[in-house]
């Protein structure tokens, strides 16, 4: 995994100017309505802001050094670090008693890489040390991937902080909801 | 009976703005996010977008970008979709359709449907 | 996106037949895979989720397999009211996607 080797702390990011994607136009306030406006949301209070109203799961450029040890590369390389939100939260409040809790209202998505390129990078080497050559995997495309609830948090580390949704006060959705119980209200359904 | 119905067919000039509406009724609305796709005449299905009705938090299909604004109102149970500078290719019919679960294979589906909105756009 | 396609796009059979149909995603997408049967006129309506768990209601003569890119929904004996158009419909990746249709036709 030559990408994952050469991501360290070591790598200094540069970001490009002008690279980032432009906010969307600001929709006209709807007080009366409930309407999907931009903005984040507070990460413990999924409900007290309007969710993202694209899915912004964005490609950000960005512009780094590769190193491997003292060795650095003889110029930097441009790469997409995949970032932002697919789409509204899906999560959906469920009171019972005194307790609110959170149940899924839709898939789990998560802004991740997609496709990767591969580069080759001359590595600069001081006191003398002849050049070396590296093949770096770089992220070339992002996507809205879907999440299950079987995945645990190992292999969520490697799609960023973005990924690591805390679960905090989940529980897994009641079984009326399953298809069989959803079909008893489909009259005519066939 | 669950069920999902729509506004009548609407006929709009290009470059206008059409806005469809999908009532539901028996179950409680705010449990499901809906979803619109749209069919063109003779063509396949295309998903547009959804909207949590507790957030009003919507997402879209970012080929609708800028053009697509879903909205819900909780007090009539119904979800709305606006569509924008319109053109002829949006000639379509438009669908509400809530996303259903299975929690034992952790599954999602469009399990009920309006019955359809026709827009033409012609000039 | 996901391209999802169907083959084939449409097909011929009498009443009592075999039908296969199936579908190819361009990416992986698990057993993400859903299939709706449309009439003329009509919202689709779900027959199979979750590439091969049948929908409550729907007839025991509907089934699906595949995993990963390739599926196939199969009718093991045609039924008159099974003449219509059927898409597939993958839910691992945004934007949803589905099939560009497979239309059965009375012969």
């Known amino acids: 995994q030559g990408w994952q080797a050469f991501k360290n702390d070591a790598t200094e990011i540069i970001p490009e100017l002008g690279e980032y994607p432009e906010p969307p136009p600001e929709l006209e306030n709807n007080k009366t309505m409930n309407r999907a406006e931009n903005g984040g949301r507070p990460p413990h209070h999924p409900f007290e802001t309007k969710d993202v109203s694209e899915y912004s799961c964005r490609e950000l450029h960005f512009t780094r050094y590769v190193t491997d040890g003292p060795c650095r590369s003889a110029k930097p390389v441009t790469e997409l670090v995949c970032s932002g939100q697919c789409g509204p939260a899906r999560l959906l409040p469920n009171a019972i008693g005194r307790g609110k809790w959170w149940r899924p209202s839709g898939p789990d998505f998560r802004c991740i890489p997609d496709r990767y390129r591969a580069q080759r990078v001359q590595l600069l080497c001081p006191g003398g040390e002849a050049p070396r050559a590296r093949k770096v995997r770089l992220v070339a495309s992002c996507k809205c991937k879907r999440l299950t609830r079987f995945h645990n948090q190992s292999e969520l580390k490697d799609f960023g902080t973005e990924a690591a949704r805390p679960q905090k006060g989940r529980k897994p959705r009641p079984r009326a909801r399953s298809a069989k119980a959803n079909q008893a209200e489909l009259e005519n359904a066939y | 009976e669950v069920q999902l119905v729509q506004s009548g067919a609407e006929v709009k000039k290009p470059g206008a703005s059409v806005k469809v509406s999908c009532k539901a009724s028996?179950?409680?609305?705010?449990?499901?996010?809906m979803h619109w796709v749209r069919q063109a005449p003779g063509q396949g299905l295309e998903w547009m977008g959804e909207?949590?009705?507790?957030?009003?938090?919507?997402g879209y299909n970012q080929k609708f970008k800028g053009r697509v604004t879903m909205t819900t109102d909780t007090s009539t149970s119904t979800a709305y979709m606006e569509l924008r500078s319109l053109r002829s290719d949006d000639t379509a019919v438009y669908y509400c359709?809530?996303?259903?679960?299975?929690?034992?294979?952790?599954?999602?589906?469009?399990?009920?449907w309006g019955q359809g909105t026709t827009v033409t756009v012609s000039s | 996106d996901i391209q999802m396609t169907q083959s084939p796009s449409s097909l011929s059979a009498s009443v009592g037949d075999r039908v296969t149909i199936t579908c190819r995603a361009s990416q992986d997408i698990s057993n993400y895979l859903n299939w709706y049967q449309q009439k003329p006129g009509k919202a689709p309506k779900l027959l199979i989720y979750h590439t091969s768990r049948l929908l409550s209601g729907v007839p025991s003569r509907f089934s699906g397999s595949g995993s990963g890119t390739d599926f196939t929904l199969t009718i093991s004996s045609l039924q008159p009211e099974d003449f219509a158009t059927y898409y597939c419909?993958?839910?691992?990746?945004?934007?949803?996607?589905f099939g560009g249709g497979t239309k059965v036709e009375i012969k």
């Open positions: 909207i949590n009705p507790n957030s009003g938090g919507a």
């Open positions: 028996g179950y409680t609305f705010t449990d499901y996010n």
């Open positions: 419909q993958q839910g691992d990746t945004l934007p949803y996607t």
């Open positions: 359709a809530r996303l259903g679960y299975d929690d034992i294979y952790d599954d999602w589906y469009f399990d009920v």
